[in-house]
């Protein structure tokens, strides 16, 4: 059929709750393309009728809710003027084990998500909720071991649960829950998170060293594509996260819709004493709004930025 297979994504999901997957693969999906979803190599596209339990919503496939029989491989076909690409998504649906309904009806949580809190620090957990904008998400509630979390040490901040002065007792099984409303119907979304505690000082016990960038500006022409590497050295056993942010937001979140600026896949080279990590940021097309804005590379507690600036005019041309 002339379509190029890009990659296979595996997702393990809970039955009886909503699920959505967005078909994006920059730079392919950043241009003028059409996106069509299919199930199990069927020639018939997934319905676009919003009343259908499974339907395509713009570039998303949306299950309202997921059911046992929905397991299988789904294909997303991305067609451009002169190209065709295909992403395969392997969905496996399982039944969650629930708490005794007499004590609140929350799940006996699996290790579906794993997150770490840092002992003695102020830290946070994230509720991963990925749905199209047609889905209105109600306030997020947080639970630990099936009991709703309350108390002075906890603050719900958007999709985060802030935890101040993390203690060993904070390890355990958490869940975040929200009511999703779509076309007047309500569904419960509930994600399980297994939380462990690390005793490392700071975020990982070492201060990572950012080799590049070095808090400097880069001259780049308007409209060009730009890729900048962030190179970081860190200890071999570190648990530090490395990422690019703009306006205090992960670039992939900040440019969630347009995908114009994306973080690359992290790679690393292992040396005897340390690891060298590289994570890039790609500007598919530099726009005026990018100039003068600090794009920050974060590695644990270390940060460094680049600022894009227009090249100085070449007066020799006049």
């Amino acid at each position: 059929d002339g379509c190029k297979d890009i990659f296979m994504k595996n997702e393990i999901l809970s039955a009886s709750q909503p699920f959505a997957f967005n078909c994006t693969f920059p730079p392919i999906t950043s241009g003028e393309v059409s996106v069509t979803w299919y199930k199990n190599s069927s020639k018939i596209p997934v319905s676009k009728i919003i009343q259908s339990r499974i339907h395509q919503d713009e570039t998303w496939i949306l299950f309202l809710p997921m059911e046992w029989g929905d397991s299988g491989v789904y294909q997303c076909v991305i067609k451009g003027r002169d190209s065709c690409h295909r992403i395969h998504v392997n969905l496996t649906v399982f039944e969650k084990h629930w708490c005794d309904t007499s004590i609140g009806g929350l799940p006996n949580l699996s290790d579906e998500y794993k997150q770490i809190l840092h002992l003695g620090k102020d830290d946070s957990l994230t509720c991963h909720l990925h749905f199209p904008k047609s889905c209105v998400l109600g306030p997020i509630k947080w639970y630990k071991d099936c009991n709703e979390i309350k108390g002075e040490r906890f603050t719900v901040l958007e999709t985060r649960l802030l935890v101040s002065n993390v203690s060993a007792e904070d390890r355990g099984n958490y869940a975040c829950q929200a009511i999703l409303t779509h076309s007047g119907k309500q569904y419960e979304v509930l994600n399980g998170i297994t939380v462990s505690i690390t005793e490392r000082a700071g975020y990982g016990g070492s201060v990572p060293k950012i080799i590049y960038p070095k808090n400097h500006s880069i001259e780049v022409q308007l409209g060009t594509t730009l890729i900048v590497d962030c190179n970081v050295t860190d200890t071999k056993d570190n648990t530090n996260l490395r990422c690019w942010r703009v306006n205090n937001t992960l670039v992939d979140d900040y440019y969630d819709e347009s995908k114009r600026i994306r973080e690359g896949v992290e790679t690393h080279v292992s040396f005897r004493e340390h690891n060298l990590y590289t994570v890039n940021i790609t500007f598919l097309e530099v726009k005026m709004e990018d100039y003068g804005l600090p794009f920050m590379c974060h590695a644990g507690v270390s940060t460094a930025y680049i600022i894009l600036q227009l090249p100085a005019p070449d007066f020799r041309a006049y």
Partner: antibody, heavy 117, light 107 residues
Framework: QVQFQESGPGLVKPSQTLSLTCTVS?????????WNWIRQPPGKGLEWIGY???????NYNPSLKSRVTISRDTSKNQFSLKLSSVTAADTAVYFC??????????WGQGTLVTVSS | DIQMTQSPSSLSASVGDRVTITCRAS??????LNWYQQKPGKAPKLLIY???RLHSGVPSRFSPSGSGTDYTFTISSLQPEDIATYYC?????????FGGGTKVEIK
């Protein structure tokens, strides 16, 4: 719970520097997020002034950039605003707030600063 | 700067009425749109973030929608405690900017 308390003089003379401090409890300002100043002149709308992030980098509204400095004292879990060369147009209620990935999620109760001789 | 234009600037409605406020951005803000409620003499409170997500403790009668440059905020059944000024705010591009506000009153 994350909470804020703004403090500073309620009256500042024209041409002087306005100085305010925001004391944060319930979360370390060096752990994450951006810590913001926002103002609201009496009977008017809201204007974002600037932020200092958890890593210490700052960003200011271009309309005020030449006059604004935001700094922090991590030992006291405080961040501060200095606005120089004030005029009557700077009379406003000044709020501090935490910005999550998307929004100004929690705010202090605000403090009124009047610029008058 | 991105200009945020809110309408109407004020409205008067009866308890139980459906109330809609609109917010238009001067350019596409990719759903980075938040709504706040401010009562006299108080700080603004976050109601909705990222176009369609309700903040902690916000009742379901507050209903958001929109995309691109146009966003709406609906109170399905106005309650006496909803009397306030409502602001939209874009978080897409620095400097972050607010709409001029919509004052909601009871008839």
């Amino acid at each position: 719970q994350v909470q804020f308390q703004e403090s500073g003089p309620g009256l500042v003379k024209p041409s002087q520097t306005l100085s305010l401090t925001c004391t944060v409890s319930g979360y370390s300002i060096t752990s994450d997020f951006a810590w913001n100043w926002i103002r609201q002149p009496p009977g008017k709308g809201l204007e974002w002034i600037g932020y200092i992030s958890y890593s210490g980098d700052t960003n200011y509204n271009p309309s005020l950039k030449s006059r604004v400095t935001i700094s922090r004292d991590t030992s006291k879990n405080q961040f501060s605003l200095k606005l120089s060369s004030v005029t009557a147009a700077d009379t406003a209620v000044y709020f501090c707030a935490i910005r999550g990935p998307y929004s100004f999620t929690y705010w202090g109760q605000g403090t009124l600063v009047t610029v008058s001789s | 700067d991105i200009q945020m234009t809110q309408s109407p600037s004020s409205l008067s409605a009866s308890v139980g009425d459906r109330v809609t406020i609109t917010c238009r951005a001067s350019q596409d803000i990719n759903n980075y749109l938040n709504w706040y409620q401010q009562k006299p003499g108080k700080a603004p409170k976050l109601l909705i973030y990222y176009t369609s997500r309700l903040h902690s403790g916000v009742p379901s009668r507050f209903s958001p929608s929109g995309s691109g440059t146009d966003y709406t905020f609906t109170i399905s059944s106005l309650q006496p405690e909803d009397i306030a000024t409502y602001y939209c705010q874009q978080g897409h591009t620095l400097p972050w900017t607010f709409g001029g506000g919509t004052k909601v009153e009871i008839k």
